[in-house]
Structure formats: C-alpha cells, structure tokens
Amino acid sequence: KNLKSPQKVEVDIIDDNFILRWNRSDESVGNVTFSFDYQKTGMDNWIKLSGCQNITSTKCNFSSLKLNVYEEIKLRIRAEKENTSSWYEVDSFTPFRKAQIGPPEVHLEAEDKAIVIHISPGTKDSVMWALDGLSFTYSLVIWKNSSGVEERIENIYSRHKIYKLSPETTYCLKVKAALLTSWKIGVYSPVHCIKTTVENELPPPENIEVSVQNQNYVLKWDYTYANMTFQVQWLHAFLKRNPGNHLYKWKQIPDCENVKTTQCVFPQNVFQKGIYLLRVQASDGNNTSFWSEEIKFDTEIQAFLLPPVFNIRSLSDSFHIYIGAPKQSGNTPVIQDYPLIYEIIFWENTSNAERKIIEKKTDVTVPNLKPLTVYCVKARAHTMDEKLNKSSVFSDAVCEKTKPGNTSK
C-alpha cells in the first residue's frame, strides 16, 4: 500500500524552542516514522533536519539546529515504513517572523503597601532575541486574591514597583513581554502571588517635588512626623530598562544625606543633562521607612521651569495680570519648550484667605475685587502635560492696591 504524505504541518517557535507538529495521513497504518529535511534560501540541496529523523510521534524539536533566525527556510516531511511517501513541502518561513515571545521569569518582593517586580526574559541569552534584549517592554495584570478584580499595567520595564496597595493582603499577577518594534506580544507568565507585609511604623515620604532656585535644585517632600532624618538617592532612568547592568545602583545625593528638614538643596551641576529617578527615605534613628515613590526628574524640563514674571494693571474691581517668560541671569528671557498653565494665588493683604485661579493664557483678569484694597499676588507655572508633572516654585508676591470705584473701564 502506498504511504500518504503527512499533512497540516505547524511550526511553533517560542523563544529559542522550535517545535514541529503534524497530522498522520493514515491512522490505520502502524509503525510509521516521519523525517524532515530543510533547505536554506538560495540553496538547491536539502539537508536532514537533526532532531526530526525517524520520529514515531507527530511532534519533534529542532531547537539544537543553529539557524540564522533572520533567514528564510523551507521544510519538507515524509512518512516512512518499508517504503516512503512522497515529500510534503511546508510553506517557507523566517524563524524571527514566526517566533513568539515566551513567558518571562518573574520575581516578587513585598513591602507593606507596594510590590517590587523583577522581570527577565524566559530564555537566558536567547539567540532569537539577541538583538532585541533591551527593547522588551512588559505588561502585567494584577488582582487582589480575595476579589479577583483585575487591573492592567502597560509599558513597564524589567524593574517595576506597584504602589498604593493594602498591607497584609495577597496580590496575584501575571506578566507578558512585548517587542513593540516587531509587533510581537508574548505569552503570559504563570501566576505569581505574594502577601504584602504588616504596615510599617514609618510611612514613606510623599509628594516629592523638584524646583530650581538660583543655581540650585530644591527638593521638597511631605512627611507625617517631626524629628526625622531623611536621605535622598538617584538613579539614571534608562537603567530601569536594563537592571542587569552593573551600573544599576542607587546613589546618594551628598547634600541630601541625613537632612533633618523636609527639603534639601543641591547644586545644579550635581546632575549632567539627562533623566533621573529620585527617591526619599525617612528614619527616626531606630526605624526606617520604605522608600518613597520614585519621581522622574528631567534636567532639561526642570531647568526651564522657572517661576513666571508678571505685572499687574489695577482697576477698581479687578486686576489685569500679564505673565511673561522668566528671566535668566543676564536678563534674557527663558524659552519655554513645553505648554504651560499658570496658577495664580491672591489674597487681601489684611487676610490670609487665598483665592486660586488656573489659566492657560498669559493675560488674566482677576474679577470681584474691592476698591481701594491691597491685594497680593504670586504665581507659578505647571507643565500642561500631567505626565511631565513639573511645577516651578512660586514667584515672589507682588502687592497692589485697587483703584477707587468706577474705574473698571
């Protein structure tokens, strides 16, 4: 009886694992084996595919074959018993194009209200992704074990921290990798669960902000308790993508070690141009808080976000405020590369009740004022894009008296 060729050959490639699956054409014939050949582009001869010769099952692994993953190859299969079937040719394919990203490895560390996630590719030193190792981004799904309500977090790197969690609570998550440059989305990792720790006695510092004053950076934060000492550390932001790098070490800011106030001042020349991450930790001598949420600090944006300058035209029942670009030393205006919004705070000189106005335009009317009354005004700039999340310090307050009645024209 003539043997029929096998059909429906599927090539599955996950990371560096090359798997072939196929269907028997004739289930009634026993003791059949199967063999594959391969052919590289531009070659006439077929070569036996090692790992896929005389196979009794309908699956084989040819991962040991050292292929150029960017080069197109062709496969063919036949069945063998006493005689052989005709060859069945599989559509040619390029391994890299066909490859899927496997599940990443995930390691978790718990804090009281945060989880630190260390992610690495599932296959170490992968040949398939050798040129793309630093281009991986990851996404994850996390849920409270008790509720199952899922939250997705996209576009994270190999070290990520999830904040604002509940203490002593079990959270579960799964992670998948993506190579956005190649439109590849990977397979989810197994589910990993971890329980957050008991609430720490000392909370981490909050609301960290950086501003510029003279030739210095001013770093401020909020803290719940008095009589604490704080330390501040920095890291190059790009190292988050590549935590295997031996440079992945948080470093102290010398002027911000063991400070006793909720701010520290350090010279601008501490940082070269670039994007950094900053974090703050509190200590009372006996106990230490966990690190604060990390804030992104871009020297380019920060340098530009100086407090606005403004002048005031006073009427009887309103002020017209004209906001101009801040001045550098040498009285040259700073060019702002980012769309800004302005926060204007004003108050009656004899009162501490403040009113706040937020405007996008640089000429602002402050209405509903009383005649012949001294009002004080200060202003600061914010980046309109909340992701940049940058604010200048407030300008110095300027105080002006409104005019007598009937001068509002």
């Epitope: 919004i341 926060e343 009113r355 706040k356 106005i357 937020i358 405007e359 996008k360 335009k361 009317t365 209405p367 509903n368 914010h382 909340e386």
Partner: nanobody, 126 residues
C-alpha cells in the same frame, strides 16, 4: 471659603444609572469651572467631567464619554453628573471639584488644582 457638598452616590448593578449632585457655597459660581474627578482604592485620581458654568461648555475623560453627562442649575448653584451604562471599573469615590478658570476648564484641571468636596462613594457590581 469654598464649600462643595456631594450627594447621590450608592450601589448599583452594572448597566445601571446614578445621578450625583454637587451644591456649592462660599464660591463665585458663575464663570467658573466645576465638575468631577474620581479615585478608586490604590489608584491615581482620574478626571471625569468638567463644565464651564459661564457658558455650559462640557468636557469629558475618554473613559466616560457617551455614558456620563454633566449639567448645571445656575439658580441652585449646583452641578450634576448623570452616569449611565455603569461598569464595575467605574467603582470609586467621586469628588466634586471647582476651580476658577476661564481658559483651562478640563477634568485634568479639576483633578490637579480644584477645591474638592468630601466625596461620595459609587459602587458598581457585576
């Protein structure tokens, strides 16, 4: 002193509706920006809707467009948030917020800079 008082929160099944109200006092109501932001446990604040009380122009976050509508009643110094086709992911504490602004009345402005009320809880179950 600006005072904002929300009401109308509660529990509802997915697909249901709720109407939140916010009464303001101690605040120049006309020609200002009012509206809503929300915060779910363990999540960042999210701007929801804003209305310019001087002309009634409205602005919405993408996540609620077509489902939520904000409106005002000038006589009562009150703004409303009509929430239809509610989803479990709408579960959050909803805050009414107000900020003086003629040129930057957005949900983002309210979330970042607005004076806010005490909040009202909205829970949507599946």
């Amino acid at each position: 002193q600006v005072q904002l008082q929300e009401s109308g929160g509660g529990s509802v099944q997915a697909g249901g509706s709720l109407r939140l109200s916010c009464a303001s006092s101690g605040y120049t109501y006309s020609n200002n920006c009012m509206g809503w932001f929300r915060q779910a446990p363990g999540k960042e604040r999210e701007g929801v809707a804003a209305i310019y009380t001087g002309g009634g122009s409205t602005y919405y976050a993408d996540s609620v467009k077509g489902r939520f509508t904000t409106s005002q009643d000038n006589a009562k110094n009150t703004v409303y948030l009509q929430m239809n086709s509610l989803k479990p992911e709408d579960t959050a504490m909803y805050y009414c917020a107000a900020v003086e602004s003629r040129t930057y009345c957005t949900p983002d402005a309210l979330k970042r800079f607005g004076y806010r009320g005490q909040g009202t809880q909205v829970t949507v179950s599946s």
